[in-house]
């Protein structure tokens, strides 16, 4: 069969109908990733609290970020949301700080659970916070007598009861 | 309406501390950043730092070590305080809310001339 | 830090002149540009973000335009309210930064 002409066009062009289907470039401020377009895509703009990344070519589209005191959501960063503090959740009543026994060490994201250290069979070397997991330390097998001039750590605990600095919360 | 005020002393010795408090109304400080801004008499505008809902902090590098800013929620008021300051830090103080929509200040409180001189 | 230069620094005009501000950013700032007028011994206002997007209230003589290093605040129609001095911002990096500012003066 008869080989399409617009399969011969790069990425970069489009198969222009209006002119006998010759390889056109994209037109500024647009981009064909694929060859064999028959139209090039208009470049995302990165305005408002978006912040471009990576600018538009015409192979590729733009890519945004987020402007200072914002961070991405969603694929390609389709939304821009508030930095919380570290120790803290966004909510949809604002920031919140975390709840005992979960910790964020990031301005974005979610909560997460502290680390159960005795899940493996390790002691609880350094205190969760809201802003940092707890470390675990060895198991109380791998610490000989007087291998160790560490002060001991404390007995690992049940899950949801590992010690906690609660000051100022 | 959205409405942002200063206040704080108008006289500060050299080497204190400047103190200031922004007042806010008519918007919800869950939701809204807020700037501060100064400007040298006769000169232009100089950012130095932003709270933002959450109370994460980001300052000017260059004022880093002397400039703290903080918020009250319950009061609806931010406060900012600059350390150590010289007759360099004279300015009018402005705070200025910062909207959902980019990093900038869409409304402005009246401003505070802060004069330091002993 | 990103500097902005603004230029002219003043510029005298008649009610009804076309004036043009621009404003240069030491790096690619992308549009993540703002404008504000302030009128004397007031506070700031936004007039402009994102280089050429209006503010609410603004009137539709004031116009922004620019992206990447070059931006342009431009009113068509010169007011007599108009007299101020206009600062370009950039919000794309800390610290945000000002241009030095451009004061209007009405003949």
């Known amino acids: 069969g008869l080989q399409d002409p617009c399969s011969n066009c790069p990425a970069g062009t489009f198969c222009d109908n209006n002119r006998n289907q010759i390889c056109s470039p994209c037109p500024p401020n647009s981009f064909s990733s694929a060859g064999g377009q028959r139209t090039c895509d208009i470049c995302r703009q990165c305005k408002g609290v978006f912040r471009t990344r990576k600018e538009c070519s015409s192979t590729s589209n733009a890519e945004c970020d987020c402007t200072p005191g914002f961070h991405c959501l969603g694929a390609g960063c389709s939304m821009c949301e508030q930095d919380c503090k570290q120790g803290q959740e966004l909510t949809k009543k604002g920031c919140k700080d975390c709840c005992f026994g979960t910790f964020n060490d990031q301005k974005r994201g979610i909560c997460r659970p502290w680390t159960n250290c005795s899940l493996d069979g390790k002691s609880v070397l350094v205190n969760g916070t809201k802003e940092r997991d707890v470390v675990c330390g060895p198991s109380p097998a791998d610490l000989s007598p007087g291998a160790s001039s560490v002060t001991p750590p404390a007995p690992a605990r049940e899950p949801g009861h590992s010690p906690q600095d609660i000051e100022g919360r | 309406q959205v409405q942002l005020q200063e206040s704080g002393p108008g006289l500060v010795k050299p080497s204190e501390t400047l103190s200031l408090t922004c007042t806010v109304s008519g918007f919800s400080l869950i939701s809204y950043g807020v700037h501060w801004v100064r400007q040298p008499p006769g000169k232009g505008l100089e950012w130095l730092g932003v709270i933002w809902s959450g109370g994460s902090t980001d300052y000017n590098p260059s004022l880093k070590s002397r400039v703290t800013i903080s918020k009250d929620t319950s009061k609806n008021q931010f406060s900012l305080k600059l350390s150590s300051v010289t007759a360099a830090d004279t300015a009018v103080y402005y705070c200025?809310?910062?909207?959902?929509?980019?990093?900038?200040?869409?409304?402005w409180g009246q401003g505070t001339l802060v004069t330091v001189s002993s | 830090d990103i500097q902005m230069t603004q230029s002219p620094s003043s510029l005298s005009a008649s009610v009804g002149d076309r004036v043009t501000v621009t404003c240069r950013a030491s790096q690619n700032v992308g549009t993540n540009v703002a404008w504000y007028q302030q009128k004397p011994g007031k506070a700031p206002k936004a007039l402009i973000y994102?280089?050429?997007y209006r503010d609410s209230g603004v009137p539709s003589r004031f116009s922004g335009s620019g992206s990447g290093t070059d931006f342009t605040l431009t009113i068509s129609s010169v007011q007599p309210e108009d007299l101020a001095t206009y600062y370009c911002q950039q919000y794309n990096s800390y610290p945000l930064t000002f241009g030095g500012g451009t004061k209007l003066e009405i003949k």
């Open positions: 200025a809310r910062n909207p959902l929509t980019a990093t900038v200040m869409d409304y």
């Open positions: 994102s280089a050429s």
